[in-house]
């Protein structure tokens, strides 16, 4: 049969409120070496159990009888420390248990999830959460909005998520937990109303270095908007903005555009390149959510101005020209020059030279027409650039090199009759 | 010395539920927890879960939640574990085990086959 | 909850032999417990509180470790211990066991 227990005081019970400080304790009488005192809370060993021990002996012999004490400090009561308590030690071959103490928690509500502050576009519907527990239980919730009760008594409403259909000025929540104890108030959330994001974000139209673009702005409760904001960005290759990014990977060009009109030019943009933009409208609650980002392009342009360098000279019944690129934007993609030149009393001759940048012209009359000018234009899908101003065709002198080149013959009949070519040409002399 | 008897085999069929009793000797049963560790064939230990005699209280592992209940009999030192809808997966030998922060004393096991 | 992984699964040593059986949990432990069970009967504790030998059992078990690693020795190895070996922990709820080793004897 078994020995008779050496425990001779039990651990008591304890019941509190969350955050109570309490100490269990219990003492058992022992012959020879004290055993370690071990804690068991509903059957498992405490492992950081906050527990002292104080041994004394009742005698001057090692062998005499000892009295142990273990106290276990319970520092700071929550609901994980409620249960059955019990001293557990291990004597010899055998293993003895005190009887157990119970160590439970009951006060007002305690709140696992509170009312958080968020902003809500206007009108818009958003949920609510609030999570309080006891014991003792039933924990019942009441809502309250700006204050007042959203039910008529605890528990009848809605009780872990309030389901607000929209809001169109900002408001405050807070939820009331009520058990047999008394009542707790969760913290006050704020819900801050803002404008709806914008719709409808479009282009109007487009110049080589400026976009017209316009919205429709959403609801924003009873709060007048005050500006609009329009952000473009270059939309780079492997920027992206196409895959959702969310901001852009580089300084946007940001304009504010005062409200109605919901209306916007963007000015000193590229020519002939790709954007993306999107817009977000503020209240004097705060901004609204930016649309998505909006692919635009500028369009083509024509250059901005005359190729430079350009050097003419005549040997005989052959003209040489050659020129540079233009130093000014060329606003798209060059497609080519075109030349005109012209005598004092011949009419002038158009000539589209594509992209290369020299031509030798072969003269009709052995070169003997007088005061020869030369023109160059260069031009992109949207039309030719400014011409250069004349530049007269000078003689060859020996020693000036002549760069083979392909001659560019006129027709023998008419003189000086060359097609014009269906493009702009600006007279310039 | 302390000693743990349980019931003998069952067969039971799909659906049917199945109660294993562990008879405690040479201890105070009420101070003690009682567990239950079940293994299937050729496999590991698996905790059930406790009651403690001396109250009634219980704690079941989350597996076997809504389908097992431990009981006592204070006055014959028994302490019982029911496990319904039985399923053929539930084949296993079924240990009860005293428990003082680990299992020192173990019953000799109680068969319980899950065949239709 | 915490897994336990023992190594090796399956052991086959000559008696006289030292044999070490680790437990690995999954996350930090206290203490842990090992059981043996030899076959067609029910586990018997070896070793409570990591270090302390059960009511019974020979000097030539022990047990050892901390944190996540854990290690049961058998000193010099006899016929009686051939046996399925269990490592088990109660730091938290539920408690687990380890798969198991079993010890086959040469």
């Known amino acids: 049969q078994a020995e008779e227990s050496p425990f001779v005081g039990n651990p008591g019970n304890i019941t509190g409120a969350r955050g109570l400080t309490g100490t269990l304790r219990c003492q058992l009488q022992v012959q020879g070496e004290p055993p370690e005192v071990h804690w068991l809370r509903d059957g498992q060993i405490l492992e950081l159990a906050d527990s002292t021990q104080t041994q004394v002996p009742l005698g001057e012999d090692e062998q005499d009888d000892w009295i142990v004490v273990s106290q276990l400090r319970i520092t700071s009561l929550q609901l994980s420390d409620t249960g059955q308590y019990q001293c557990l030690v291990f004597l010899g071959h055998q293993t003895f248990v005190s009887q157990p103490g119970y160590v439970g928690l009951e006060g007002l509500p305690y709140f696992l999830e509170e009312p958080e502050d968020r902003t809500v576009a206007a009108n818009t519907p958003f949920n609510l959460s609030c999570q309080a527990q006891g014991p003792p239980e039933p924990v019942d919730l009441l809502w309250l909005q700006d204050a007042v009760p959203l039910a008529t008594a605890p528990g009848h409403g809605p009780q872990r998520s309030l389901h607000v259909p929209g809001l169109n000025k900002t408001s405050s929540f807070s939820c009331e937990a009520h058990n047999a104890k008394g009542v707790t108030t969760s913290r006050t959330a704020t819900i801050t109303v803002l404008p709806q994001q914008p719709r409808n974000l479009h282009l109007v139209s487009r110049q080589p270095t400026e976009l017209e673009v316009a919205w429709t702005p959403g609801l924003s409760g009873i709060y007048p908007l005050t500006h609009c904001t329009l952000q473009a960005v270059l939309s780079d290759d492997g920027m992206g903005i196409q895959a959702g990014e969310p901001d852009p990977p580089e300084e946007p060009l940001t304009s504010q555009a005062s409200v109605p009109p919901h209306q916007l030019r963007l000015g000193s943009l590229h020519p002939h390149t790709p954007y993306h933009i999107r817009v977000a409208c503020t209240s004097s609650q705060g901004p609204s959510s930016w649309t998505h980002w909006l692919p635009v392009e500028t369009p083509e342009g024509v250059p901005l101005g005359p190729p430079e360098n350009i050097s003419a000279t005549r040997n005989g019944s052959q003209a040489f020209v050659h020129w540079q690129e233009p130093r000014a934007p060329l606003q798209g993609t060059l497609l080519g020059y075109r030349l005109a030149y012209q005598g004092q009393d011949t009419p002038e001759v158009l000539m589209d030279i594509g992209l290369r940048q020299e031509v030798t012209l072969e003269l009709q009359g052995d070169g003997s027409v007088s005061n020869l000018t030369v023109c160059v234009a260069a031009y992109t899908a949207a039309g030719d650039g400014p011409w250069s101003l004349p530049v007269p065709l000078e003689a060859w002198r020996p020693g000036q090199a002549q760069p083979v080149h392909q001659l560019v013959k006129e027709p023998s009949t008419p003189a000086f009759s060359w097609p014009h070519h269906h493009h702009h040409h600006h007279h310039h002399h | 010395q302390v000693q743990l008897v349980q019931s003998g085999a069952e067969v039971k069929k799909p659906g049917a539920s199945v109660k294993v009793s562990c008879k405690a000797s040479?201890?105070?049963?009420?101070?003690?927890?009682i567990n239950w560790v079940r293994q299937a064939p050729g496999q590991g230990l698996e905790w059930m879960g406790w009651?403690?005699?001396?109250?009634?209280?219980?704690k079941y592992n989350e597996k076997f939640k809504g389908r097992v209940t431990m009981t006592r009999d204070t006055s014959i030192s028994t302490a019982y574990m029911e496990l319904s809808r039985l399923r053929s997966d539930d084949t296993a030998v079924y240990y009860c085990?005293?428990?003082?922060?680990?299992?020192?004393?173990w019953g000799q096991g109680t068969l319980v086959t899950v065949s239709s | 909850q915490i897994v336990l992984t023992q190594s090796p699964d399956f052991q086959s040593v000559t008696p006289k032999e030292k044999v070490t059986i680790t437990c690995s949990a999954s996350?930090?432990?206290?203490?842990m417990y090992w059981y043996q069970q030899k076959p067609d009967q029910s586990p018997k504790s070896l070793i409570y509180?990591?270090?302390n030998l059960a009511s019974g059992v020979p000097s030539r078990f022990s047990g050892s470790g901390s944190g996540t690693d854990y290690t049961l020795t058998i000193n010099s190895l006899e016929a009686e211990d051939a046996a399925t070996y269990y490592c088990?922990?109660?730091?938290?709820?539920?408690?687990?066991f380890g798969q198991g080793t079993k010890l086959e004897i040469k």
């Open positions: 085990a005293r428990s003082t922060g680990f299992f020192d004393y």
């Open positions: 040479g201890y105070p049963f009420t101070d003690f927890y």
């Open positions: 009651i403690y005699p001396g109250s009634g209280n219980t």
């Open positions: 996350s930090s432990i206290g203490y």
């Open positions: 509180l990591t270090s």
């Open positions: 088990q922990q109660w730091s938290s709820n539920p408690p687990t």
